[in-house]
């Protein structure tokens, strides 16, 4: 275990001073929900003899609107909260003047992230406290001081999961057009250790990274017409929850043993990941479960290997394409890393290398829309927040969207007395108004059959005392007596 | 994972009627409510109409659809419906099914597509 390695340190690097360009005007005095960080926002940056102009939007998709975090309190007891009204600073975008350029930086404490132009990546992060127009490294991934990481898992296990891999089975897309088929959607769970928490020191700094990579992460897969939406954060702040081993195959199987204990009174999740500060054996940085995404063995383990957070980011990626159904592209024939990136620098790349890769290989994506046939993949269908991603929310519609407590349809027809129908907010003195855990307006205590078994394999559901649902339906894993 | 399957969609002329529906993968009764909502090219998703799935039915509708859509369910055969008679060509869009049975959770299908021509 390595939580007090100091992080790597760049070989090389700009020194550039940020400007950030004005943008419309807007009044003084914002409603304090509206927050401090714009919309929309431009910096130029003087690097490598070029102007970039970096044209960024704050990811409004980055949280799913019932978005948990877990921690454990001063007392010992173990919280879970739903942050309500929390402005952020993580934006996504493009650099003007590059068609296929693309752009995930955080703006909270000066630029940090990455851009995209061409074939390079450019990284970005404060060299001291000066803020956004202070004084900030600007550098390539290969000038970050450390060694390449490799993923875990191994070529056999792909092979007998995969079958036979040629390139005859991959069509080659023209140019980045986005698959034409409908945007799916990731609703990630990330479990931090304690490792990782004693290494950054606070739980501000963990969430802050966290929301860093996993911007970064939306954005590498947004060119497969994917977005990873983060549903849950939780961090062992105290105690690691089951032994975080430095072998990945055993730290995986401990997470998914406890995923699947945990299940039932955890945020719903499509995918689980795990962030460790504990250094795996060997040039190791992550595992995972080859075509899990959307069942109980949904997740994988990722080594926060880098100072900079694009590293984990860059790993997850590459670990989630493997849950996704993804092979390395070395055991591909014929697979096409577009032609102007050099070979190895696709995510799907056995080994990370010096340089941190910044797309999808051609490959990649056929073995993608390949597990998206499969009923499996239904999970990936539905928008975490329909009323965010999908349309504005109506009050009214009996569905329960973004700043509703409750809907019980319009006012003439509602009979709901727990639930305001002309502004969808609970009534006076309500704990719910919805769930079969609510009943005359309060949440049932906790122990109260909710779901009865349905057959032998089926587990019954007891409501938990703090939500107006009954938890998730669970069932015994097969094979169990 | 719950499944929704949307069938019906199709191309009619303005004027004309065509019945959308959801199957379900299990009992549409677990849910809260299932809605319809729908995509034309280029714009955002928009709520059509909704029908609750137990106790008494409500069923809300977009304005725009009072009078000339009809939501309805049929609870033994885990179906909802949509029927659309008197159709414009700005009802022209890809049609979803989505259901709810938790706050801020949805399910939502594959949807179909409606082509209405003047």
């Known amino acids: 275990i390595a939580p007090s390695r100091p992080w790597a340190l760049m070989e090389q690097y700009e020194v550039v001073l940020p400007w950030r360009l004005p943008g419309p005007r807007v009044r003084r005095a914002l409603p304090s929900h509206l927050g401090l960080h714009p919309e929309r926002v431009s910096y130029v940056l003087g690097a490598t003899g070029h102007n970039f102009t970096l044209h960024l939007r704050k990811n409004r998709d980055l949280l799913g609107s019932g978005y948990t975090e877990t921690y454990t309190a001063a007392n010992g007891s173990e919280v879970t909260e739903q942050p309500r009204g929390q402005d952020h600073c993580f934006y996504q975008g493009h650099v003007e003047g590059y068609p296929d350029s693309a752009a995930s930086l955080s703006t909270c404490a000066g630029l940090r992230g990455f851009f995209q132009v061409g074939s390079d990546l450019h990284l970005i992060e404060p060299l001291d406290e000066g803020g956004e127009g202070g004084r900030h490294a600007v550098y390539q991934a290969e000038h970050l001081l450390q060694t390449a990481g490799t993923c875990g898992v191994s070529d056999d296990s792909l092979g007998s999961l995969l079958g036979p891999r040629t390139a005859a089975v991959f069509r080659p897309r023209p140019g980045d057009s986005l698959p034409s088929r409908e945007t799916r959607y990731v609703e990630l769970y990330v479990v931090v250790d304690n490792a990782e928490f004693q290494m950054l020191g606070s739980e501000a700094a963990v969430r802050h990274r966290v929301l860093e990579v996993v911007n970064h992460v939306d954005k590498l897969y947004q060119k497969l017409n994917f977005r990873v939406v983060l549903v849950g954060l939780e961090i062992w702040n105290s105690q690691d929850r089951f032994h975080v081993s430095p072998d990945p195959s055993v730290t995986l199987e401990n997470l998914l043993t406890w995923q699947a204990r945990q299940r039932t009174r955890r945020h719903l999740h499509d995918n689980v990941q795990l962030i460790t500060g504990v250094d795996f054996t060997g040039t190791t940085v992550g595992f995972a479960r080859v075509s899990a995404m959307c069942s109980h063995s949904s997740g994988a383990v990722n080594q926060d290997h880098s100072k900079n957070p694009v590293g984990v980011a860059c790993t997850m990626a590459h670990e989630m394409g493997h849950n996704l159904g993804m092979d390395h592209d070395e055991n591909v024939q014929g697979c096409r890393c577009q032609e102007r990136f050099e070979a190895g620098r696709c995510i799907m790349a056995g080994s990370i290398g010096s340089s941190f890769p910044r797309m999808f290989s051609d490959c990649s994506q056929a073995y993608l829309e390949s597990f998206l046939e499969r009923p499996q993949s239904v999970c990936l269908a539905n928008a975490p927040d329909l009323s965010h991603l999908v349309g504005g929310p109506v009050c009214g519609n009996l569905f329960v969207e973004r700043g509703e407590q409750c809907d019980c349809g319009p006012p003439e027809d509602c009979r709901n007395r727990c639930c305001n129908s002309t502004t969808c907010q609970l009534a006076e003195g309500a704990q719910c108004a919805h769930g079969t855990c609510c009943q005359e307006c309060k949440v049932k205590p906790a122990g109260e059959l909710c779901r009865p078994k349905k057959d032998m394999c089926d587990l019954e559901e007891f409501c938990d005392g703090r939500h107006p649902e009954c938890p998730e339906d669970a069932f015994q894993e097969n094979g169990t007596p | 994972e719950v499944q929704l399957v949307e069938s019906g969609g199709g191309l009619a002329q303005a004027g004309g009627s065509l019945r959308l529906s959801c199957a379900a993968s299990?009992?549409?009764?677990?849910?809260?409510?299932v809605g319809w909502w729908r995509q034309a090219p280029g714009t955002q998703r928009e709520w059509v109409a909704s029908?609750?799935?137990?106790?008494?039915?409500?069923?809300?509708y977009v304005d725009s659809v009072k009078g000339r859509f009809t939501i309805s369910k049929d609870n033994t055969k885990n179906t909802v419906y949509l029927q659309m008679n008197s159709l414009k060509p700005e009802d022209t869009a890809v049609y979803y099914c989505c259901?709810?049975?938790?706050?801020?959770?949805?399910?939502c299908g594959q949807g179909t597509q409606v082509t209405v021509s003047s």
């Open positions: 029908i609750s799935t137990s106790g008494s039915t409500i069923t809300p």
């Open positions: 299990g009992s549409i009764t677990s849910f809260n409510a």
């Open positions: 259901a709810t049975e938790r706050m801020h959770h949805s399910y």
